[in-house]
């Protein structure tokens, strides 16, 4: 069972696994949640009862029971890891720790006018994990405003000491806000021969290559398949460090598959949530129960539904044998990937889909998308809400993205003339407007913030948050888009649609269903020339056919861009403005979002 | 078990050349690949050169045009020859199977099927 609130006074009794150091005990909440194996922990706060060499120790524990003895300890705090609860879990940490020193390698020491310029230099440095600054009050005169980098094996200090006039910090790259480029591709035949940090065994580069992502040293990696000539080293996942950042060293291999870490994309595309299924593959590993199961599905669920259980291997019936129904291996290992992967044996394996919930919920695939054809089907663009004004009477109004369980993403324009967002309504998993009735559950909007810098939408910042005054249950006809990744700018979006319920030419009415069109995004350069008496700016992406006749128009303002990349869709733009509609030569002119991921992580992360 | 013998380290005068040496035992070449890494003091472990199982070769920037890798498969045995040495390449050398770069910047811990020869010492006075 799920219990969040943390034991004070009280220390667990035995089933140590590790013991690190973190600056609260809510952060080694978060430690214990990541770790493989952690189940419970015990964190030991500042005590004059404790001796200051186990202050800020936070010991990450485990049980068969799921659970152990409790004992009264002053200053020690205890608690249960997130991995037993169904809510959305993340490691971003925004916490800036006051008198601490968080001990690591200092591998970096510059000047910093602020403890945030610190934090933000962390960010965009591929080897910083965490960081300590010197304020300008800090008694030694040359220590004064040195911003010091750090990094460690594990990605926590090695150590936590009081230290006057100092704070310290976390990285917040796993908060989506750091600069650093995104390089998804996959390098076939290649081996990166830099320094190896940690070796494990993965069914696929695709599953190395997230394992890399998670592991807080790594950087690239190298993946043997099991093609590999050596027998000794199929299915290998090399992780894998330099100074640079980089591979310095790349030497063409067959049956060998080279790739990077997604930390800085870790936000917009799976990397906890393994969802495959491998065939006539065996994961090895300590057994922890055997159980009777009709599918390999159904083995998943299982093994998903047991806290421990990290992944599986399920053995098919024979014929008329127990029912239909096979064996089920729940596995665990101290690493929570396989020690052995076997081919040729007939299991079919998998993972624990319990990590997802650390994914973003927005880089859940959805339904296949319908090819040709205009109108929508439910369930095609689960993030599309369609934002009605009541007043005078109610009407669609304009388009929205959902972003966030409490948070739509549209454009500041459609609020020329709304004085108050009571008279406002979200309504979510729309297809038809018609749908809308007197009783149709909506979501009230508790705040509208628009962008302070928005005068009109043809000269930007036509951007909009709606926080909504309850929070949306994902399902598959209301789930968020994700937002692009500030390390993807560079990424050419091939596959992208418009959506919404706008009129099909200028003059017309909103239609009743959901309508789609396929549009190429077009430079910025070639918009320019198309809207000589407009700045189109780096803030404003365009899209639309040179031939004109597909395009967003009145009333799908505020509505989502969505480009599909690497099988995730995300929300590039939000429809703004255009010169009429669908016309020759005048591409529609959308919002660009990627410039404000800072600006929405800022109003929607505010504490 | 599978051992990796270095031979043929030594002391040379810079501008000097020396042909390092390793032959395995319970193991066969032909189908690893092999490499020579070396480790000065105080410094990471660093790949100076590879030879694959089919035949691609690789040399570290420092050493290109002066270092050749080469092996003889019917003596189990890997050679590198290496001229007009200068002090930086003062190290101890060692011989690695299977092993795709170092762990923790250090030449002797592997992965599983990786394996590391003991090192010699190579010492180039200027």
């Known amino acids: 069972e799920c219990v969040t609130q943390l034991l004070k006074d009280t220390c667990f009794e035995g089933g140590d696994i590790t013991t690190v150091f973190t600056p609260s005990a809510k952060y080694c909440q978060v430690v214990c949640t990541y770790h493989p194996r952690c189940l419970l922990f015990t964190f030991t706060a500042e005590s004059p009862s404790e001796d200051p060499t186990r202050w800020f120790t936070c010991v990450l524990k485990d049980s068969v029971t799921e659970t152990l003895p409790r004992v009264n300890r002053t200053a020690a705090i205890s608690g249960y890891s997130f991995k037993q609860c169904s809510h959305q879990i993340s490691a971003c940490n925004k916490d800036i720790y006051v008198d601490l020193d968080m001990k690591g390698i200092n591998y970096n020491s510059s000047v910093a006018k602020s403890a945030q310029e610190c934090q933000e230099r962390c960010t965009d440095d591929v080897h910083c994990h965490f960081f300590t600054y010197a304020t300008r009050q800090f008694p030694s005169l040359e220590h004064r405003n040195i911003c010091l980098l750090k990094h460690t094996q594990t990605g926590t200090p090695t150590r936590i000491t009081k230290l006057d006039k100092v704070v310290s910090g976390f990285s917040l790259k796993s908060c989506a806000l750091s600069n650093l480029a995104c390089i998804r591709d996959i390098f076939p035949n290649t081996v990166f021969a830099d320094s190896n940090i940690d070796s494990v065994m993965a069914p696929d580069a695709f599953v190395c290559g997230r394992i890399c992502t998670h592991h807080p040293g790594c950087l690239f990696f190298t993946f043997f398949s099991q093609e590999w000539p050596k027998e000794s080293q199929r299915n290998l996942c090399l992780l894998k460090t330099s100074e640079s950042g980089l591979p310095s060293t790349r030497i063409k291999k067959s049956k060998a598959l080279s790739g990077f870490s997604l930390q800085s994309c870790r936000h917009s595309i799976p990397v906890f949530c393994h969802s495959s299924f491998y065939h006539d593959t065996d994961f090895l590993g300590e057994e922890l129960d055997i159980v009777a199961a009709k599918s390999h599905e159904a083995c998943q669920k299982l093994c998903t539904n047991a806290v421990r259980c990290q992944f599986f291997t399920y053995t098919p019936a024979q014929a008329s044998c127990n029912e239909g129904k096979g064996k089920c291996y729940l596995k665990l290992s101290s690493n929570g990937s396989p020690t052995k992967i076997l081919h040729g044996r007939g299991g079919i394996s998998g993972y624990t889909l319990r990590l997802c919930k650390m994914d973003n919920e927005c880089t859940t695939k959805i339904k296949p998308r319908i090819v040709g054809g205009t109108a929508s089907v439910r369930g095609e663009w689960p993030w599309q809400v369609t934002l009605h004004t009541t007043s005078p009477t109610q009407r669609h109004l304009c388009g929205g993205s959902i972003i966030g369980n409490q948070w739509i993403l549209t454009a500041a324009h459609c609020f020329y003339g709304v004085e108050s967002p009571k008279i406002l309504r979200v309504y979510s998993g729309i297809l038809n407007q018609s749908e809308i009735k007197e009783d149709t559950s909506f979501f009230g909007v508790q705040e509208i913030i628009i962008h302070d810098q928005y005068k009109m939408a043809e000269s930007g910042y036509d951007i909009a948050l709606l926080k909504l005054e309850t929070t949306v249950n994902y399902t598959d006809s209301q789930r968020p888009i994700c937002l692009p990744s500030k390390g993807d700018r560079n990424v050419i979006y091939t596959d992208c649609w418009v959506t919404g319920w706008g009129y099909r030419k200028l003059r017309d009415k909103i239609q009743n269903t959901l309508q789609k069109a396929k549009i190429p995004l077009v430079t910025n350069e070639e918009c320019q020339k198309r809207y000589r008496g407009h700045k189109i700016t780096h803030k404003m992406i365009c899209a639309g056919y040179r031939e004109g006749g597909k395009d967003a128009c009145k009333g799908d303002s505020g509505g989502p861009l969505s480009c599909k990349h690497n099988e995730v869709w995300h929300l590039v733009g939000i429809t703004s403005w255009g010169e009429g509609c669908a016309q020759r030569e005048r591409p529609g002119v959308y919002t660009n979002v990627v410039e404000y991921v800072d600006w929405i992580l800022e109003k929607t992360q505010a504490v | 078990q599978v051992q990796l013998v270095e031979s043929g380290g030594g002391s040379v005068q810079a501008g000097g050349s020396l042909r390092l040496s390793c032959t395995a035992s319970?193991?066969?070449?032909?189908?690893?690949?092999m490499a020579w890494y070396r480790q000065a003091p105080g410094n990471e472990c660093e790949l100076v050169s590879t030879?694959?199982?089919?035949?691609?070769?690789y040399y570290a920037d420092s050493v290109k045009g002066r270092f050749t890798i080469s092996q003889d498969n019917s003596k189990n045995t890997m050679y590198l020859q290496m001229n007009s040495l200068r002090a930086e390449d003062t190290a101890v050398y060692y011989c690695?199977?299977?092993?795709?770069?170092?762990?923790?910047?250090?030449?002797?811990?592997?992965?599983?099927?990786?394996?590391w020869g003991q090192g010699t010492l190579v010492t180039v006075s200027s």
């Open positions: 319970e193991f066969t070449f032909d189908d690893s690949d």
């Open positions: 690695a199977a299977d092993q795709w770069g170092s762990a923790e910047g250090d030449c002797t811990s592997s992965y599983p099927g990786g394996y």
């Open positions: 030879i694959t199982s089919d035949g691609g070769t």
